[in-house]
């Protein structure tokens, strides 16, 4: 399956955060909300598929609670009245830990993937096509909320890149009721005229190989890896790049390359036998200086969950972990457009690219 | 025939400035990685800087950052070594070259270099 | 910065004689190491690439091999006109450095 035609990501919204479903849930719908559980305040987030903003409708709530061990409540609320609690006494989260959270719409449910494994299936008690709405309260930061719309397209193996048929441009500022914490950037740095989400499948209309598993039950089935993809029209400032995974738990590296022809723009390097993310770039077989620095402790952690937003400027690229700014890296190759090919290798296993 | 020619050395007083060109016949200086490597008299050789102009690079020495600035003509097919405040150290023997490249390799080996011209810095 | 120490600085040789030029990297270069020859008041000339690749017009009798951080540049049989400076330059690592250079001489 191959998607195209997809709503542009919320980039680090604010939380509380209401945000506009452009053409509301369809069947083959992904959404997925990445971020971190905050550590300090709260026992509880949400995530809500509603019809409008008011919170009376929601055809979907899915409710973490780290309360009497951890559980996970799913309802529904229609005209303002909760329905029977579906209750999974599993807790996938972990508190101060980031995650990446998927929801596929289906004819008869929701499926809840939480970082690239099957969590829950919630049946629908109210028609999805109401929804147009997507909210997220309690103690969570977000890095991104996405969408994928399904088309079906003749898919090359391994993934698949469609480009839009129509630019497509971010959506008002949500409706965030605080500030985004220090350190994030502004969620809509300018329009975005392409987005490409990277699936991938291992035969014509299976999405993996697992011959067991029904196609399009995991929407993040495992990257290929390396993975290699193309960035179509090569950066550009305001260009976005959204990559989420989970770190081995024996991981020692791994790298996201950005790359011009025989050269690499950019190499991002988590190194955990150095406990250092390093930056550099490579011409002609030739490496630069590295750039090591960083404000905080290394944010890849082995067997942890991760996301990576690279955002390139006029000047540079800025790179955020988890929602959180951690560098910037000034452009050694400045003609951006001719930097147009993404490599990702090395000890993690993809589970979201969007380029 | 590839060639190389460079020119503009000469005799200057410290912190005075110079402009070095490297005229390219032969290939196209836009695609290629032009390098400026200096040998001071009686010494060995040491890079300078580099230039990739499609792919909009450059890259300079440690000891010329911030003094010398590399670039391309490509509708002139040269490129330029501007140095600014120019020291005694800097006297030297100034060659430009092309990296060698092919289909099996790429790197920063210079298989073509200039005849070389002589810049002395002093007083 | 990655250091090139390149040995022996100076040596004679007869015509004739096989001739080893060592170079050690200070850290691991890959294979990315050139050897050039340089004649006084010419400017240098491509002999090796890619530590062993020979380049195109260049004699047999020259030679490049690596093993780990040391890089070797071997004339099978000195000839007249190879009496020259030798250096070796690694790309691995920005800055590109060279070799402080040997000269063969003759005995």
């Known amino acids: 399956m191959a998607f195209s035609g997809s709503q542009a990501p919320y980039l680090s919204p604010a939380v509380p955060f209401s945000g506009t479903i452009q053409g509301g849930l369809q069947d083959g719908l992904q959404i997925t909300v990445n971020g971190t559980v905050l550590s300090s305040s709260g026992t509880r987030f949400a995530v809500n598929f509603q019809t409008g903003f008011s919170g009376n409708d929601i055809a979907f709530h899915f409710n973490p609670r780290f309360e009497d061990g951890g559980y996970v409540v799913c309802n529904t609320r229609q005209n303002g009245s909760w329905g029977p609690e579906e209750r999974k006494t599993h807790m996938p989260f972990q508190k101060g830990m980031p995650f990446d959270l998927c929801f596929l719409v289906q004819s008869s449910d929701f499926k809840v993937m939480v970082n690239g494994i099957l969590f829950v299936q919630y049946f629908h008690r109210v028609p999805f096509h109401r929804v147009d709405t997507i909210s997220v309260n309690g103690s969570v930061q977000l890095s991104y909320i996405s969408f994928q719309n399904p088309r079906t397209v003749p898919v090359q193996p391994a993934f698949s890149t469609v480009p839009f048929s129509q630019p497509v441009c971010f959506p008002p500022r949500p409706r965030g009721r605080r500030q985004k914490p220090p350190g994030v950037w502004p969620a809509n740095p300018a329009p975005i005229t392409q987005t490409v989400i990277h699936t991938v499948q291992s035969a014509p209309g299976q999405m993996f190989s697992t011959p067991a598993i029904p196609p399009m039950m995991y929407p993040h089935p495992a990257y290929p890896m390396p993975f290699i993809t193309t960035i179509l029209g090569g950066l550009y400032p305001s260009k976005s790049i959204l990559l989420s995974g989970t770190v081995l738990p024996s991981a020692q590296r791994f790298h996201i390359n950005l790359c011009s022809g025989n050269h690499i723009a950019f190499h991002l390097n988590p190194r955990f036998d150095e406990n250092a993310v390093v930056r550099n770039t490579q011409i002609d077989n030739s490496w630069g200086s590295e750039e090591r620095s960083l404000p905080r402790k290394m944010p890849f952690v082995r067997g942890q969950s991760f996301s990576v937003w690279i955002l390139c400027e006029a000047h540079c690229l800025k790179v955020a972990v988890d929602g959180q700014h951690l560098f910037e890296y000034y452009h050694r190759l400045r003609n951006l457009p001719t930097i147009n090919r993404l490599e990702v290798g090395g000890d993690i296993q993809l589970t979201h690219v969007q380029t | 025939e590839v060639q190389l020619v460079e020119s503009g050395g000469g005799l200057v007083q410290p912190g005075g400035s110079l402009r070095l060109s490297c005229a390219a016949s032969?290939?196209?200086?836009?695609?290629?990685?032009i390098h400026w490597v200096r040998q001071a008299p009686g010494k060995g050789l040491e890079w300078v800087a580099s230039?990739?102009?499609?792919?909009?690079?450059?890259s300079y020495a440690d000891s010329v950052k911030g003094r010398f600035t590399i670039s391309a003509d490509t509708s002139k097919n040269t490129a330029y070594l501007q140095m600014n405040s120019l020291r005694a150290e800097d006297t030297a023997v100034y060659y430009c070259?092309?990296?060698?490249?092919?289909?099996?390799?790429?790197?920063?080996?210079?298989?073509?270099w200039g005849q070389g011209t002589l810049v002395t810095v002093s007083s | 910065d990655i250091q090139m120490t390149q040995s022996p600085s100076s040596l004679s040789a007869s015509v004739g004689d096989r001739v080893t030029i060592t170079c050690r990297a200070s850290?691991?270069?890959?294979?990315?190491v050139a050897w050039y020859q340089q004649k006084p008041g010419k400017a240098p000339k491509l002999l090796i690439y890619?530590?062993?690749s020979l380049y195109s017009g260049v004699p047999s009798r020259f030679s490049g091999s690596r093993s780990g951080t040391d890089f070797t540049l071997t004339i099978s049989s000195l000839q007249p006109e190879d009496f020259a400076t030798y250096y070796c330059?690694?790309?691995?690592?920005?800055?590109?450095?060279f070799g402080q250079g040997t000269k063969v001489e003759i005995k």
């Open positions: 070259a092309r990296s060698y490249s092919s289909e099996t390799h790429y790197g920063w080996a210079m298989d073509y």
């Open positions: 032969g290939f196209t200086v836009y695609s290629s990685s």
């Open positions: 230039i990739y102009s499609s792919y909009g690079y450059t």
């Open positions: 850290q691991s270069v890959s294979s990315a």
């Open positions: 890619s530590a062993s």
């Open positions: 330059q690694q790309w691995s690592q920005s800055p590109v450095t």
